[in-house]
């Protein structure tokens, strides 16, 4: 059974031309480190993406076809997320267990660069995506996924890792960003908000979505994650926005129905294997791509982010379950687990489709075209 999904024909969030500057003060959610303009000592700039050596071609995979009859989102609101809170809610929960207060958190102290210097780097994630400023890169071909439809056995580990819900993926899930850019999926996790407050990490024209899924991949050029951290293209994350729709999403329900079992920080359970690709949008051909970082400490850079243009729909009840079931550190609900958007600092977001071409009346100013720097051009 396919998911109810929304098909974006115009770019997410509509479009208007603008500068490559970070969002204003109104878009500082639960963040702790103010964006830095200069490099921290010893942090290298990681400019364009490099092709990684020693990689073989993946078996050819047929890209997903566009679904017919899916909803259009011509009028997605482009307003700022209203009053993103500075800190997550702190609700009393069972007995206190805190030790020292040096661990990183969403909101409040300590500032992330003090926790991990890389968090002050120039090329951090998440970012605000401005479709009008994205560079159309015809070389960005549809993503290729192989082996993502998992059988029920062996079961997978679903865990409350303290700041998110995380599903560990078995070996054999292959993903290609393009020729010679092959990856293996490692895990997926989610970011969300709270009741009535959106919690995606990336934003589009300042619009924050209810939630966001990240599927983390390791380049086949590396044997281990710690070897790949900080290396350009060492890690790749597929990101998709989750939105509210009228129907229950059956794929997500397989995970959401088990959250009660892992309400406690650090707890885990086993869930049957499922079709991981069903958690993602169906259109693998339209996406934005840029080089950024992990969105939590250690904030390692060199991560290739691919953000789908199409969104995934969950029911209101499912989004509520996601944001209202888990507990995190300090006896607080695990909510609002997203980092503020970070400055682009000269980075150009690339698009696999002409995202800057928008016939809507919003695009009154001339479209600023950025040049395509994609690998393979």
């Amino acid at each position: 059974q396919r998911l109810p999904r929304m098909q974006e024909d115009s770019p997410l969030g509509g479009g208007s031309s603008g500068e490559d500057d970070p969002l204003g003060e109104e878009d500082l959610p639960s963040e702790e480190d103010s964006p830095r303009e200069e490099d921290p000592p010893g942090e290298e700039d990681l400019p364009g993406e490099e092709d990684l050596p020693g990689e073989e071609d993946l078996p050819e995979v047929k890209p997903k076809s566009e679904e017919e009859g899916s909803l259009k989102l011509e009028d997605l609101p482009t307003v700022e997320a209203p009053g993103d809170p500075q800190e997550p809610q702190n609700n009393a929960h069972r007995d206190k267990e805190g030790d020292d207060q040096s661990h990183w958190r969403y909101g409040g102290d300590p500032p992330w660069p003090r926790v991990s210097p890389a968090c002050a780097g120039r090329f951090q994630s998440p970012v605000d995506i401005r479709p009008q400023l994205a560079a159309f890169c015809p070389a960005l071909r549809p993503l290729e996924l192989l082996g993502f439809q998992l059988p029920p056995l062996p079961e997978l580990r679903l865990r409350n890792n303290g700041h998110s819900v995380q599903l560990t993926l078995p070996p054999g899930l292959e993903m290609a960003l393009g020729p010679g850019r092959e990856y293996r999926a490692l895990q997926l996790h989610l970011h969300w908000g709270a009741a009535g407050r959106p919690g995606s990490e990336h934003t589009v024209e300042g619009h924050r979505f209810p939630a966001e899924i990240h599927v983390v991949h390791l380049s086949t050029a590396f044997a281990r994650v710690d070897e790949a951290l900080g290396r350009p293209g060492g890690l790749a994350v597929l990101a998709a926005f989750l939105e509210e729709g009228p129907e229950e999403n059956s794929a997500y329900e397989q995970l959401l129905s088990r959250l009660e079992e892992i309400a406690e920080e650090g707890s885990e359970t086993q869930v049957p294997g499922l079709d991981i690709s069903a958690l993602l949008p169906s259109d693998f051909s339209r996406y934005f791509q840029y080089e950024g970082s992990l969105t939590t400490p250690p904030c390692a850079q060199g991560v290739i982010w691919t953000v789908f243009n199409q969104t995934v729909m969950l029911s209101a009840k499912q989004l509520h379950t996601l944001s209202d079931t888990l507990w995190g550190p300090g006896d607080s609900r695990l909510q609002l687990n997203f980092r503020a958007t970070q400055p682009l600092n000269g980075r150009v977001i690339e698009a696999s489709f002409p995202a800057g071409v928008d016939s809507s009346p919003r695009a009154a100013e001339p479209v600023q075209l950025n040049s395509c720097l994609a690998a393979g051009d």
């Epitope: 991990s116 865990r159 939590t296 250690p298």
Partner: nanobody, 133 residues
Framework: QVKLEESGGDLVQPGGSLRLSCAAS????????IGWFRQAPGKEREGVSC????????YYADSVKGRFTISRDNAKNMVYLQMNSLKPEDTAIYYC??????????????????????????WGQGTQVTVSS
Amino acid sequence: QVKLEESGGDLVQPGGSLRLSCAASGFTLDYYAIGWFRQAPGKEREGVSCFSSVDGSTYYADSVKGRFTISRDNAKNMVYLQMNSLKPEDTAIYYCAAELYGELGVATVQAMCRLTTPGGDYWGQGTQVTVSS
């Protein structure tokens, strides 16, 4: 070859002290949370103390607070567990474990210390600690 290896376990009298060592080889602990776990006969494995190399945060189980101290030697890629005022109930096999810290793995040291099953990235073989007179 990537591995964790514990050492330092021994037979000690109640009230005595021991220092356990965990040597990481084949990888650096820089991006990891490191935990000491123990399993007594007939009991579940429990997290004793956990430490994050990323943000320096530490966690101790209530049963060992004030008696045990976790530390790391960056140059030697080692993690230690200093155990003082040992009690008979501290008798167990002690394991060292490491898992990526942050969104890629375990995001808090409390969560790390609740990994009672060998689901972490790396686990050692264990070292026996016996507290008896």
